[in-house]
Interface confidence: low
């Protein structure tokens, strides 16, 4: 006989993340005796909650909460029963509870608190519901793009850790509701709210970062749609063929598409809006998103935001990913450079409503808004961030990294567990299980 | 046809507690969620809460916090509601309600559909 | 919380008139429903998310208004029509109703 070492108790935490059209959510694991070494937490499994986002329950708190239960009931399954008293739970909203909190912070709390109602219920270590900022929501991208793809720390043959000459990736992610840039920079930000500086596993990071509420992708969507209803009475976006009945009421409830609400509008009526498929107007609609006017700064991205020069590589996920994945896989079009990015959302544009269908077979349902959602895109990197053809050859548009998904939620697991250590690890050497 | 059948009056004294009932019929009693309203005398309607009674978890208006206890029991399809420290104040008509929503574009929209006859509670020594 | 007002508290109208309630809000919502309330009864829906009929509601009356201002018209009052009215806002917590409009035909 010989002896049999056995592989380490593993340890879970539990992230639920409300995002604004959806939420997701994802259960990690490390194994108990390698808490602090870089790259050992990894996605165990997840769930998608069915139906809209918390937000969307503001009429309805409990439902927000009852629509959670099922994924929970999924989450008892998934970590073993010995380890749902140690298993921490975080739900964490982003956007679409930042605008809700904005127009009725009172929907806004009693939806956290009947989350917090039900997820008191179960057996984890509940450690509370909060709205993140959009800062805390860049940053976290940051960490977990970065801790995903081994950056800060790496364990070397000679048994030490050192930290990899690469650099760290910049973060693009695009929501609902909100989207983030956040990168690594050398220089102190002009605008201090710009700057967070982080410890890591004994190294310094000054990092760049900044949310724009309202450009989500469903917000922008919302914000186009009232665009080409106050100015054209057609959708340019929208392929020719398309047709559909807008209720103004739908339109204008956002505070993104306040600006551009008539004084009298009818909330109940219906107004039957078509598309065009005129890539040319659809991208003058895009446009109008971004104002360039002033920059009380050096230098800005746009609406007088202060940004440095966009430097590095960079990972580009959530509805990044999905949009350019759209165009790479659906519509088999190149999208290796900028000018080819332009070019995909203009072949996308000028597809009539019967050719888009014929081409995308069985994918109904926001068909209808990838010509937006490509223009957008493509207007964001290289207008809005400033990215040029060579800056843009460093960005990789992904979904996930060593089979965990990207975004913002295992960072922010990451940060409240401590498993991010501020201190370097000491000469330990790892022992592989596997 | 969709009912919800609640019992005439309840005659209670101050200090003491209250518990009424509503029985739904006709409709998959955990597919909608259940709410209360208060209407005293010659007065205006104010919500109380609700229920889902798939999952047992309600919401409150803070005003009626401690006041009111929402509950239901599946099996009879049958939503309670227990009022506690009874007083003048508390003497109205309590109806329950079907909450009825239809969804337009991700937003879930709410009225009541169906309401009870309502139970008339007096609190009076 | 939002408080809804409804004017006048209390209407007399003749059979046939067109008569107008309004509801005002103290703060702006998406959407409001509308109650009627005949004598001794429950309530019962009449319109909702502002301007649709509810079933077997008669299509003498309609809604509209947007924001902080809405209203209830019946092109042509009958007997029946005698009742209380209310609004009712779901747009922020806690869900609110108006006072009320009792209307009574001459």
């Known amino acids: 006989t010989r002896d049999v070492r056995e592989p380490p108790a593993l340890k879970y935490g539990i992230v639920l993340d409300a995002g604004s059209s959806h939420t997701s959510m994802f259960i990690y694991k490390w194994p108990a005796d390698k808490e602090n070494d870089t790259g050992i937490v990894g996605q165990h499994s997840s769930c998608d909650v069915p139906g809209g986002g918390i937000s969307s329950y503001a009429d309805n708190p409990s439902g927000a909460s009852q629509s959670l239960v099922g994924c929970l009931e999924q989450a008892l399954q998934d970590v073993p029963k010995e380890r749902h008293a140690g298993t921490p739970l975080y739900l964490g909203a982003t956007a679409g509870m930042r605008l809700l909190n904005l127009t009725n912070p009172e929907a806004s709390t009693s939806v956290l608190m009947a989350v917090t109602h039900t997820l008191t219920q179960y057996p984890f270590d509940f450690r509370g519901a909060r709205i993140l900022s959009g800062q805390e929501e860049g940053v976290f991208g940051w960490v977990t793009a970065n801790y995903l793809l081994e950056n800060f720390i790496k364990y070397g043959w000679v048994g030490r850790w050192f930290r990899p000459r690469k650099g760290t990736l910049g973060a693009m992610d695009l929501g609902g509701a909100s989207t983030q840039i956040t990168f690594e920079t050398t220089s102190p930000a002009e605008d201090r709210a710009s700057e967070v500086q982080l410890h890591l596993y004994g190294q310094h990071y000054r990092v760049y970062t900044h949310s724009f509420l309202c450009y989500g992708r469903d917000q922008v969507l919302q914000r186009l749609l009232a665009s080409a209803l106050q100015t054209h009475g057609f959708h340019p976006c929208w392929p020719r063929g398309f047709s559909t009945q807008v209720l103004l009421g739908d339109v204008y409830q956002s505070p993104c598409t306040m600006a551009q609400r008539p004084q009298n509008f009818n909330s109940s009526a219906r107004v039957s809006l078509s598309g065009s498929s005129d890539p040319h107007l659809c991208r003058d609609l895009v446009s109008g998103l971004f104002s360039f006017s002033s920059c009380p700064f050096s230098r800005c991205s746009f609406n007088g935001v202060f940004q440095p020069p966009v430097a590095g590589n960079f990972v580009a996920f959530s509805a990044f990913f999905y949009t350019v994945d759209f165009l790479r896989t659906s519509m088999g079009l190149p999208v290796a450079t900028l000018q080819q990015l332009e070019a995909a959302a203009v072949n996308v544009c000028n597809q009539t409503w019967a050719q888009l269908q014929a081409r995308v077979p069985g994918q109904r349902a926001r068909l209808a808004d990838y010509c937006a959602g490509a223009m957008f895109v493509q207007q964001l990197l290289s207008r809005g961030y400033g990215f040029d053809e060579r800056a843009f050859g460093g960005v990789i548009f992904q979904k996930k990294a060593a089979d965990t998904a990207v975004g913002w939620a295992l960072g922010y697991m990451l940060n409240l567990t401590n498993l991010i250590p501020a201190d370097p690890p000491g000469l330990r050497k790892g022992t592989d299980f596997s | 046809e969709v009912q919800l059948q609640q019992f005439g009056a309840e005659l209670v004294k101050p200090g003491a507690s209250v518990k009424i009932s509503c029985k739904a019929s006709g409709y998959t009693f955990t597919d909608y969620n259940m709410d209360w309203v208060k209407q005293s005398h010659g007065k205006s309607l104010e919500w109380i809460g609700d229920?889902?009674?798939?999952?047992?978890?309600?919401t409150y208006n803070q005003q009626f916090k401690g006041k009111a206890t929402l509950t239901v029991d599946k099996s009879s399809s049958t939503a309670y509601m227990e009022l506690r420290s009874l007083t003048s104040e508390d003497t109205a008509v309590y109806y329950c309600?079907?909450?009825?929503?239809?969804?337009?574009?991700?937003?879930?929209?709410?009225?009541?559909?169906?309401w009870g006859a309502g139970t008339t509670v007096t609190v009076s020594s | 919380q939002i408080v809804l007002t409804q004017s006048p508290a209390i209407m007399s109208a003749s059979l046939g008139e067109e008569i107008t309630l309004t509801c005002s809000a103290s703060s702006s919502v998406s959407y409001i429903h509308w109650y009627q309330q005949k004598s001794g009864t429950s309530p019962t829906l009449l319109i909702y998310s502002t301007s649709n009929l509810a079933s077997g509601v008669p299509s003498r009356f309609s809604g509209s208004g947007s924001g902080t201002f809405y209203s209830l018209t019946i092109s042509s009052v009958e007997a029946e029509d005698a009742a209380d009215y209310y609004c009712h806002q779901w747009s922020s917590y806690p869900w609110t109703f108006g006072g009320g409009t009792k209307l009574e035909i001459k």
């Open positions: 309600a079907r909450r009825g929503f239809f969804l337009y574009y991700g937003i879930n929209y709410y009225y009541f559909d169906v």
């Open positions: 229920i889902n009674p798939k999952y047992d978890i309600s």
